[in-house]
């Protein structure tokens, strides 16, 4: 019952990371004008990764797309990458891990099979979710360098008589919505590794009491956790998806099938 | 089309108040913002502030805060301009505008005399 | 605030010549975000409302007659007429608009001889 609600809430909140992830993706907001030094400006400025729009206080919202490839920064081009990575993994995972929930039943899959499927899901999710923090990260980071730039450089003008004021941009709301679904992502990957132990039949011999009943055995660890039953009637997991994107390759120890808790 | 228009000419004692109205046509009145505009006599034109119907959002421009109130009426499609303690110096013509791309003003009222005499 | 300087203060021309006036703001009114201007020219003819003529620097409200050109990006700009016409008597404004308050400049009234 436990690994089953681990399977399915790891399930649910990859989803809603991912989900995250893809809407960071597409939000306009990744870059705002910072107002600190110039509150009274009636157009505001903000970016995202695919256009950059200007907000009049007339109402009026202009955006225009990057139309150029090679003429982006390179870093924003890396940055659209990862997260791309993110979403494509993720999406990959939640393929995976959705014939991998116990409580769905694919012909005579065996345990065995879900177990490999949720940890195959588990490590998407969590690259996934390593993406998207690192592009959100990377970002964030070219932000704080240009901010500082421009602000040595704040004000520019001939004889100090006319004033040119720099634009300077700062966090966006994508930037905190990438790092949350990131770390959902993340977390729910995690939470699928951690079920894809449970799932897997066990091998093992281990010194166990043995209550023989009506001709079906169930084998009981110490501590009275239920390690296996005999023909694996699945308990019903649900897991609704959480969207999340990851980001870089992270070392991960995985939990073999023999590794039981 | 869009049409502002304007109550009529306004004289005023000193010291009094007096609300001014825009009445706008031919639009999405919660669309846009309505700036209002003063032009004193042979003189150029200073802006006062705008309104978003809309959502009630407004922006004075500081030296006429705490002159100036600004208020919509989003069932009759009108604007009002409120000038309280009234001088001399408050004699002008006021203007309501659309707010337009660039942030400019398109389809101006009329205009509003108002004499601020003894 | 922003200071618009309009000069000339007056001019006097005659009919089908060209005019040029100009508009000089104390802060740069380009914004970076999408490379426009944010400086907008209006005519008041004697006992009238202002007209829009000219946004962002140089885009003609529609129902402008093309003879009237917006020119010039950052502090310093300039309102073309290429051929005066007899209805072109006003005063012309310019405005910031880039910058709360939003200010106008002193205008140039255009006289027909």
């Known amino acids: 019952m436990a690994v089953t609600a681990c399977q399915g809430l790891g399930f649910v909140v990859s989803l809603i990371g991912i989900a995250g992830i893809i809407a960071a993706t597409c939000m306009d907001q990744w870059s705002t004008q910072d107002l600190y030094n110039n509150p009274v400006t009636a157009v505001f400025n903000y970016q995202g990764l695919w256009r950059s729009c200007v907000r009049e206080s007339s109402g009026f919202t202009e955006c225009r797309g990057y139309f150029t490839l090679l003429g982006l920064p390179a870093m924003l081009q890396a940055v659209r990458a990862l997260m791309i990575v993110g979403i494509v993994l993720g999406a990959i995972g939640l393929l995976v891990s959705i014939f991998a929930l116990k409580c769905i039943r694919i012909g005579s899959m065996e345990d065995s099979a879900k177990a490999n499927m949720t940890l195959t899901s588990g490590i998407m999710f969590i690259v996934s979710g390593l993406c998207a923090i690192a592009g959100v990260s990377v970002f964030a980071n070219m932000l704080v360098t240009n901010f500082w730039m421009s602000t040595a450089n704040m004000y520019t003008g001939m004889g100090g008589m006319v004033q040119t004021v720099q634009t300077r941009y700062t966090f966006g709301a994508a930037l905190f919505v990438g790092w949350v679904a990131g770390g959902l992502t993340l977390i729910g990957g995690v939470m699928m590794c951690i079920a894809c132990r449970g799932l897997a039949p066990e091998e093992t011999n281990y010194k166990a009491v043995s209550y023989h009943a009506s001709g079906h055995s169930v084998a009981y660890k110490p501590g009275g956790f239920k390690a296996s039953t005999g023909f694996g009637s699945n308990t019903k997991n649900k897991k609704i998806y959480d969207g999340g994107a990851r980001t870089e390759d992270e070392v991960q120890s995985y939990p073999s099938k023999h590794d039981y808790v | 089309q869009v049409q502002l228009q304007q109550s009529g000419a306004e004289l005023v004692k000193p010291g009094a108040s007096v609300k001014l109205s825009c009445k706008a046509s031919g639009y999405t009145f919660t669309t846009f913002g309505i700036n209002w505009v003063r032009q004193r006599p042979e003189q150029g034109l200073e802006w006062i502030g705008w309104i978003f119907p809309g959502d009630g959002s407004i922006k004075y421009n500081e030296k006429f805060k705490g002159k100036a109130t600004l208020t919509t009426d989003k069932s009759s499609s009108t604007a009002y301009m409120q000038i309280s303690s009234l001088t001399s110096e408050d004699s002008a013509v006021y203007f309501c505008?659309?707010?337009?791309?660039?942030?400019?003003?398109?389809?101006w009222g009329q205009g509003t005399l108002v004499t601020v005499s003894a | 605030d922003i200071v618009m300087t309009q000069s000339p203060s007056s001019l006097a021309v005659t009919a089908g010549e060209k005019v040029t006036m100009t508009c000089k703001s104390s802060?740069?009114?380009?914004?970076?975000?999408?490379?426009?201007?944010?400086l907008t020219w209006y005519q008041q003819r004697p006992g009238q409302p202002p007209k829009l003529l000219l946004y962002w620097a140089s885009t003609r409200e529609s129902g402008v007659p093309d003879r009237f050109t917006g020119s010039g990006s950052g502090t310093d700009f300039a309102l073309t007429i290429t051929s005066v016409q007899a209805e072109d008597l006003a005063v012309y404004y310019c405005q910031n608009d880039y910058t709360y308050p939003f200010t106008f400049g002193s205008g140039t009234k255009l006289e027909i001889k």
């Open positions: 505008a659309r707010f337009y791309y660039g942030n400019s003003f398109v389809s």
């Open positions: 802060q740069s009114l380009l914004n970076s975000g999408n490379q426009k201007n944010y």
